[in-house]
Amino acid sequence: AVNGTSQFTCFYNSRANISCVWSQDGALQDTSCQVHAWPDRRRWNQTCELLPVSQASWACNLILGAPDSQKLTTVDIVTLRVLCREGVRWRVMAIQDFKPFENLRLMAPISLQVVHVETHRCNISWEISQASHYFERHLEFEARTLSPGHTWEEAPLLTLKQKQEWICLETLTPDTQYEFQVRVKPLQGEFTTWSPWSQPLAFRTKPAALGKDT
């Protein structure tokens, strides 16, 4: 049942959600499978139904409580199992003892807005969503700006090595349409990864004043 061809990866959003992806070569397509969570020091259990995301991978979200409730701490260990139905029983297909704060992936930043825009610069702010108070200021951000004629992959990454929920973009071209994205990562956790990118924020720089050098 539990074997090396199975990959089972989960991340904690630092508040009340554990998202899991399970992939297995040759897994049965029609079988009903779920993720079961059993914390070592709490009285609740939780399950979610695995839904297909590709030919051989499934995903689900364990909702542990209200979005901003702190359901796990740095000392918790949660036994996570992939269970697939065989007849009337559920077979263990994969298992891991999961340390939530070693496997963090926060929600994408939200509420991006243009605070101030000029011909060559733009000040943008954002907020973090459902992030634990445990982090205090121990977060970092990456941002990128999409310029005309380029792709997101070509956009240089701007790194903010502190909890700074704003940025001033410089050396922009006047009267030009841009898009901006940001993502966040806690400094804590051996297997912690970047949040998804935020929804892009579109903005346009102001045109250069007539008769003035740009």
């Epitope: 029983r89 077979r91 263990v92």
Partner: nanobody, 117 residues
């Protein structure tokens, strides 16, 4: 039915060592994970160390570097080598086995570890 039998507990001075053993017997076809849990009086149960069928180990942060989990598949046994013991390690240590089916969860009776001078 599966039985788990722990041994090796006792009284030890701070800084001392103990090795706990857990032997699984009965109708064991396959296990997905074996683990040691502990519970001190008035405290929550906590996972101390675990090992899956593919050999992945996890240790609680409070014991990492001091405790070592090992297994002998031929004897259906896991061992917990506990070094540099502290008074806060005092607890009843219980062995747990999760089988290949979701309803296969087995516990030992537990063995008491007391760390005191």
């Amino acid at each position: 039915q599966v039985q788990l039998q722990e041994s090796g507990g006792g009284l030890v001075q701070p800084g001392g060592s103990l090795t706990l053993s857990c032997v699984a017997s009965g109708s064991i076809l396959e296990m997905s994970r074996m683990a040691w849990y502990r519970q001190a009086p008035g405290k929550q149960r906590e996972l101390v160390a675990s090992i899956t069928s593919i050999g992945s180990k996890v240790y609680a942060d409070s014991v990492k570097g001091r405790f070592t989990l090992s297994r002998d598949n031929t004897k259906n046994t896991i061992y917990l080598q506990m070094n540099s013991l502290k008074p806060e390690d005092t607890a009843v240590y219980r062995c747990n086995l999760l089988g290949t089916w979701s309803d296969e969860t087995y516990w030992g009776q537990g063995t008491l570890v007391t760390v005191s001078s």
